[in-house]
């Protein structure tokens, strides 16, 4: 009796869904009362499927309402664990253990990343010096650096601060500001540059003709 996996690494986006599969041999029709399926992640029990039913009492609270065994897939010889609304804390090594006559287990790694996609921006002006302050803010994982550029591709020097998100402790809140003398309709870009997996997200900031009070805010 041998379990196989078509993928031993899954990479998923924060807030998305993932279905991880372990395949096992089924001849003719599945005998539910002979089947045992366990899914665990480190010391957390996620699925305990015995005698045709799941036991939600043993499920770790962090997976409550988010993890389920796709029962229809069992009849196709697959123990498929579906996790919805994936969190950064879900990243790790998962183990599927299947008993059906014999027994076997396999490990699967789940990696979770969060792109810096929703970039908030703000432009304000110092009424005394007429210097503009440009601000970009976004949340993601892992850490990102922010590159400021002008429309003629010059790299500019901004100041970036990284804090923990209020939404989820592992999520980073990255805020970057650029102080610059600029003229109306000039265009600047803030690019959130993230490694592992590598991804760039850019917002465009256009200096307005005249700034309303308070400073304008919009989301890219």
């Amino acid at each position: 009796f041998t379990i196989t996996v078509s993928k031993d690494l899954y990479v998923v986006e924060y807030g998305g869904n993932v279905t991880m599969e372990c395949k096992f041999p089924v001849e003719k029709q599945l005998n539910l009362f002979a089947l045992i399926v366990y899914w665990e992640m480190e010391d957390k029990k996620i699925i305990q499927f015995v005698n045709g039913k799941e036991d939600l009492k043993v499920q770790h609270s962090s997976y409550s309402q988010r993890a389920q065994l796709l029962k229809d897939q069992l009849f196709l010889g697959k123990a498929a664990l579906q996790i919805t609304d994936v969190r950064l804390q879900d990243a790790g090594v998962y183990c599927c253990l299947i008993g059906y006559g014999g027994a076997d287990y396999k490990r699967i790694t789940l990696k979770v990343h969060a792109p810096y996609r929703n970039i908030s921006q703000r432009i304000s002006v110092d009424p005394v010096t007429s210097e503009h302050e440009l601000m970009c803010q976004a949340e993601g994982y892992p850490e990102a650096e922010v590159i400021w550029t002008s429309s003629d591709h010059r790299v500019l020097s901004g100041k970036t601060t990284i804090t923990n998100s209020n939404r989820e402790e592992k999520l980073f809140n990255v805020t970057s500001t650029l102080n610059i003398n600029a003229t109306a309709n000039e265009i600047f870009y803030c690019t959130f540059q993230r490694s592992g997996p590598e991804e760039n997200n850019t917002a465009e900031l256009v200096i307005p003709e005249r700034l309303p009070v308070p400073a304008s805010e919009r989301t890219h």
Epitope: N51, K53, D55, L56, D72, L76
Partner: antibody, heavy 117, light 112 residues
Framework: QVQLQQSGPELVKPGASVKISCKAS????????MNWVKQRPGQGLEWIGW????????YYNERFMGKATLTVDKSSNTAYMLFSSLTSEDSAVYFC??????????WGQGTTLTVSS | DIVMTQAAFSNPVTLGTSASISCRSS???????????LSWFLQKPGQSPQLLIY???NLASGVPDRFSSSGSGTDFTLRISRVEAEDVGIYYC?????????FGGGTKLEIK
């Protein structure tokens, strides 16, 4: 609201085949199992099997393996049961029944099949 | 397969009084997760069956609370308090623990 609309009565000859349909509405068709149940005149209920439209996975009561074939058409939210090599023993009312993994909650109105020469 | 057994007829009851219908399974329907996988259906004359109770004691949507169910892992009772004329029909128990799903033979509720 959930509705399961079954096809009309069938009169067929012994040895022939028949395909009964069950059109679902009012819910996400691919998220629930579609069961089929047989009821002979004046008799009880006998579970034939189910199909999960999302994946096409099926399970048959051993008594109906080779007799019934369950299929779905996801584009029209319709489940089908093909009954083959018909005999008088197959004369019955056939119901479709929606269920999740544990609970069957909504039934079709039934399709009467009469096998007679 | 799990065999479900029911008496064909209930004791005749008077309208407004209570009735009990019994069902027995050949193996325990109580799972280690604490849930008992027994359902009750009512088939009124000329109609499709309708779900009354699931997981032994949970009332299905729209079912009056005159209906209740209890039992052990293998012996179950459906109780109808204050029987009404519209309650007549055949009551089926069914197990949803194992595959194939199986039904009892049905119990006809008789009114005096």
């Amino acid at each position: 609201q959930v509705q399961l609309q079954q096809s009309g009565p069938e009169l067929v000859k012994p040895g022939a085949s028949v395909k009964i349909s069950c059109k679902a509405s009012g819910y996400t068709f691919t998220d629930y199992y579609m069961n089929w149940v047989k009821q002979r005149p004046g008799q009880g209920l006998e579970w034939i099997g189910w199909i999960f439209p999302g994946s096409g996975a099926t399970y048959y009561n051993e008594r109906f393996m080779g007799k019934a074939t369950l299929t779905v058409d996801k584009s029209s939210n319709t489940a089908y049961m093909l009954f083959s090599s018909l005999t008088s023993e197959d004369s019955a009312v056939y119901f479709c029944l929606r269920s999740d993994w544990d609970v069957g909650d909504f039934w079709g109105q039934g399709t009467t099949l009469t096998v007679s020469s | 397969d799990i065999v479900m057994t029911q008496a064909a007829f209930s004791n005749p009851v008077t309208l407004g009084t209570s009735a009990s219908i019994s069902c027995r399974s050949s193996r325990s329907l109580l799972h280690t997760n604490g849930i008992t996988y027994l359902s009750w259906f009512l088939q009124k004359p000329g109609q499709s069956p309708q779900l009354l109770i699931y997981q032994m004691s949970n009332l299905a949507s729209g079912v009056p609370d005159r209906f209740s169910s209890s039992g052990s892992g293998t012996d179950f009772t459906l109780r109808i308090s204050r029987v009404e004329a519209e309650d007549v029909g055949i009551y089926y128990c069914a197990q949803t623990l194992g595959l194939p799903r199986t039904f009892g033979g049905g119990t006809k509720l008789e009114i005096k």
